[in-house]
């Protein structure tokens, strides 16, 4: 799994007039990390684990970055020509990643009223636009504005790519939290399914980092993919993750089945409770 930093900013307009303020959330490695507090005009950590990432450092830099990005996005929304009556939103999602082989990725996506209309691979500058004519029109509008703006201010999206990666590296280097290993708690449960069958579910929770193998085995051999159901690996709000895998088995054969878990080089097997 790559390490990632994801910025999600939204600005609003009402009857063609761009509203002051903006909404902003930042995710680090898929976990809610920061949000912009509009009352205090500050970037605020989301929970204890986020505070632990930077330790005793202030969030001034993050506040400054989010404020600048919000201002830029408001200017972009002001240049969208087809704003009709009522409420409209412009959302920008920006993601940068550092992969295990040290290669990097950086992308940027724009949504108008919740609909994707423009994406950019920031490193290569490749833009992609969905096929719809509305997306094409919006994309041309926004790209022209961004092009003009970049020429005027002499700033470029490569700087944004570099900033995002720089921040991500800073968090990774300064944070013991992001280098930690938290083994999962594994819990196996059973429930009646249909006549003669039971559903067995294996849950792994409170683990870090995100990469995990969780699978059912019969007589020590992994079951095929299509006989198992997997849940997504989701953040649990505490800077750790949770997931599950389930399968249906014949009642009376429970002792033949085990849940196999592998995480950060450690593995364990867990029987079905009788």
């Amino acid at each position: 799994e790559p390490h990632s930093l994801r910025y999600n900013l939204t600005v609003l307009s009402w009857d063609g007039s761009v509203q002051s303020g903006f909404l902003a959330e930042v995710h680090l490695d898929g976990q809610p990390f920061l949000r912009y507090d509009r009352q205090k005009c500050r970037a605020k950590p989301q929970g204890q684990w986020a505070e632990d990432v930077l330790g005793n450092k202030t969030w001034d830099r993050e506040t400054r970055d989010l404020t600048g990005n919000g201002k830029d996005l408001r200017m972009t929304l002001a240049h969208i020509k087809d704003q009709k009556e009522g409420l409209h939103s412009l959302q920008e999602i920006r993601v940068c990643e550092i992969h295990e082989d040290n290669s990097t990725r950086s992308s940027q996506h724009f949504y108008y009223d919740g609909e994707l209309f423009l994406s950019q691979n920031v490193e290569t500058e490749e833009w992609t636009v969905p096929q719809s004519s509305r997306a094409q029109t919006l994309a041309m509008n926004v790209r022209n504005f961004l092009k003009e703006d970049a020429m005027k201010t002499k700033t470029h999206y490569h700087a944004m790519h570099a900033d995002c990666l720089q921040e991500l590296r800073r968090y990774l280097e300064s944070s013991v939290v992001l280098r930690r290993r938290v083994p999962p708690m594994v819990n196996v449960t059973r429930s009646e399914a249909s006549e003669g069958n039971i559903t067995v579910t294996c849950r792994a929770s409170s683990f870090y980092p995100r990469n995990i193998t969780l699978t059912w085995r019969q007589d020590g051999v992994s079951l095929s993919h299509d006989t198992q159901q997997w849940g997504d690996v989701l953040p649990d709000g505490n800077g750790t993750y949770q997931t599950w895998v389930a399968t249906r088995i014949c009642q009376g054969e429970e002792q033949r089945f085990t849940c196999y878990m592998e995480h950060s080089g450690n593995h364990s097997t867990h029987p079905v409770p009788s």
Epitope: S107, N121, E123, T124, E125, K147, H156
Partner: antibody, heavy 115, light 108 residues
Framework: QVQLQESGPGLVKPSETLSLTCTVS?????????WNWIRQPPGKGLEWMGF???????KYNPSLKSRITISRDTSENQFSLKLSSVTAADTAVYYC????????WGQGTTVTVSS | EIVLTQSPATLSLSPGERATLSCSAT???????FHWYQQKPGQAPRLLIY???NLASGIPARFSGSGSGTSYTLTISSLEPEDFAVYYC?????????FGQGTKLEIK
């Protein structure tokens, strides 16, 4: 109809600089896309060398970084390749191509490095 | 850099048969930045499939592409004589852009 055409000397001496130009017709190189140089040594596969983007940004293959320069002449709608300190290993067919999924290519020009 | 490995290196088939060419990457690639090319002797490569599964202009429907992450496939449903050529995969996710080493599709 978009067309790309490479031009430049077919023979370069070792240690000298290889210079090629790609002339684009039917599309402005400042409108969009990356404008790439790709080469293919005899009997071998394709190697991406680098590009100049519509915005003027250049990106190079790290394997060539110390020797390669790609520039553009927007008034002539051309972009150029310079590769310094060439050796026999730089003998190849050189292509210019448009885009990221390379949708338009020049026909290629053979460059031989030999004394 | 992302290394792309194509398999097989050579594929010997007869006209009318189905061809399946594979391309494997050392690091995950976004499917919108993955493309296939066809090259015939003495010619420049030609874009065949862009963004994993979209046919380039003028390419017949017997060609199709699929895949995601680190594994991609080019399929030719029923080979025509003009399909015998070298096929290259290419990624544009990250710099440097890279090509696979090529699969030569030859007549059996």
């Amino acid at each position: 109809q978009v067309q790309l055409q490479e031009s430049g000397p077919g023979l370069v001496k070792p240690s000298e600089t290889l210079s090629l130009t790609c002339t684009v017709s039917g599309y402005s190189i400042t409108s969009d896309y990356a404008w790439n140089w790709i080469r293919q040594p005899p009997g071998k596969g394709l190697e991406w060398m680098g590009f100049v983007s519509y915005s003027g940004t250049t990106k190079y293959n790290p394997s060539l970084k110390s020797r390669i320069t790609i520039s553009r002449d927007t008034s002539e709608n051309q972009f150029s390749l310079k590769l310094s300190s060439v050796t026999a290993a730089d003998t190849a067919v050189y292509y210019c191509a448009r885009g990221y999924g390379f949708d338009y290519w020049g026909q290629g020009t053979t460059v031989t490095v030999s004394s | 850099e992302i290394v792309l490995t194509q398999s097989p290196a050579t594929l010997s088939l007869s006209p009318g048969e189905r061809a399946t060419l594979s391309c494997s990457a050392t690091s995950s690639i976004s499917s919108i930045y993955f493309h296939w090319y066809q090259q015939k002797p003495g010619q420049a490569p030609r874009l065949l499939i862009y963004r994993t599964s979209n046919l380039a202009s003028g390419i017949p429907a017997r060609f199709s592409g699929s895949g995601s992450g680190t594994s991609y496939t080019l399929t030719i449903s029923s080979l025509e004589p003009e399909d015998f050529a070298v096929y290259y995969c290419q990624q544009g996710t990250t710099i440097p852009f890279t090509f696979g080493q090529g699969t030569k599709l030859e007549i059996k």
